[in-house]
């Protein structure tokens, strides 16, 4: 059953290839365990970028090798994706699942188009 999930339509990554956006969901119940997944959609292909499960009121922890970091506050999750390059430009979808207690709820955002521009290499100085 699909919850409402909101995320910005467009975000521009900074010169270091980092993009941040907020994913906000409207919880129908009193979830204690929440799972947040970032998906990248290109044409008909969907790949998982990163995922984290957290207990409400606690910090959200991604795996050590994840390109994502994040913080949570109430029904808002602040997501940061690092190490992006121009070829990573695309639609990034926030998926939220209320894992516990039942009932299970899931919501999918409309996606954030992240634009990444590779920095110009510095000219050699003599």
């Amino acid at each position: 059953k699909a919850m409402h999930v909101a995320q910005p339509a467009v975000v521009l990554a900074n010169s270091r290839g980092t993009a941040s956006f907020v994913c906000e969901y409207a919880s129908p119940g009193k979830a204690t365990e929440v799972r947040v997944t970032v998906l990248r959609q290109a044409d008909s292909q969907v790949t998982e970028v990163c995922a984290a499960t957290y207990m409400m009121g606690n910090e959200l922890t991604f795996l050590d090798d994840s390109i994502c970091t994040g913080t949570s506050s109430g029904n808002q999750v602040n997501l940061t994706i690092q190490g992006l390059r121009a070829m990573d430009t695309g639609l990034y979808i926030c998926k939220v699942e209320l894992m516990y207690p039942p009932p299970y709820y899931m919501g999918i955002g409309n996606g954030t188009q992240i634009y990444v521009i590779d920095p110009e290499p510095c000219p050699d100085s003599d």
Epitope: A2, H4, A26, S27, P28, G29, L39, V46, K95, P103
Partner: antibody, heavy 115, light 108 residues
């Protein structure tokens, strides 16, 4: 123990109304979006209607086949959900299940539409 | 509306075997898929939610996988008690929350 008890099924003539009721216990009713799902040998499982809860302003949704004829409602104080079925058709026949989210299912109540 | 195509419609397998049931969506559904088990004369029971999560009280011999448009339910080391009809359901908005046509599993 989770329980969902549907009542109100029976034999009804085409074009006539029928109201189904479902009483829930054993879980937090007000946290659940409630559904009616029906089953017939011809169509298998078919989602019929959903009513969301207070945080979602009790929004309602219907399958195209029942839109305009069926009305789903709920009473959180009685942990109950209802399905008012008007202008019943032969194709509405089947077992009607009440579900809490899609996690909990009742035992079903049978609706027969025949002249 | 998104269509859900489940296959096979029926299958027969022996105790101890592993079987796989597939469910295809006509559009990407982002893992918004449940699987249900319905035994003869009983109500459906939630088996797998969110494509991969095992529902409480269900055997770990059941597992769900898939992404995008293609999903599958695997039942390992079949037991006689696994004889049932299995359904997938898309749980992504907007409605309808369509079910697949079902797969009837017979244990030889």
């Amino acid at each position: 123990e989770v329980k969902l008890d549907e009542t109100g099924g029976g034999l009804v003539q085409p074009g006539r109304p029928l109201k189904l009721s479902c009483v829930a216990s054993g879980f937090t009713f007000s946290d659940n979006w409630m559904n009616w799902v029906r089953q017939s040998p011809e169509k298998g499982l078919e989602w019929v209607a959903q009513i969301r809860n207070k945080p979602y302003n009790y929004e309602t949704y219907y399958s195209d086949s029942v839109k305009g004829r069926f009305t789903i409602s709920r009473d959180d104080s009685k942990s109950s959900v209802y399905l008012q079925m008007n202008n019943l058709r032969v194709e509405d026949m089947g077992i009607y299940y009440c579900t809490g989210g899609m996690d909990y299912w009742g035992q079903g109540t049978s609706v027969t539409v025949s002249s | 509306d998104i269509q859900m195509t489940q296959s096979p419609a029926s299958l027969s397998a022996s105790v101890g075997e592993t079987v796989t049931i597939t469910c295809g969506a006509s559009e990407i559904i982002y893992g918004a898929l449940n699987w249900y088990q319905q035994k003869q004369g009983k109500s459906p029971q939630l088996l797998i939610y969110g494509a991969t999560n095992l529902a409480d009280g269900m055997s770990s011999r059941f597992s769900g996988s898939g992404s995008g448009r293609q999903y599958s339910l695997k039942i390992s080391s079949l037991h006689p008690d696994d004889a049932a009809t299995y359904y997938c359901q898309k749980i992504l908005s907007p409605p309808p929350w369509t079910f697949g046509g079902g797969t009837k599993l017979e244990i030889k």
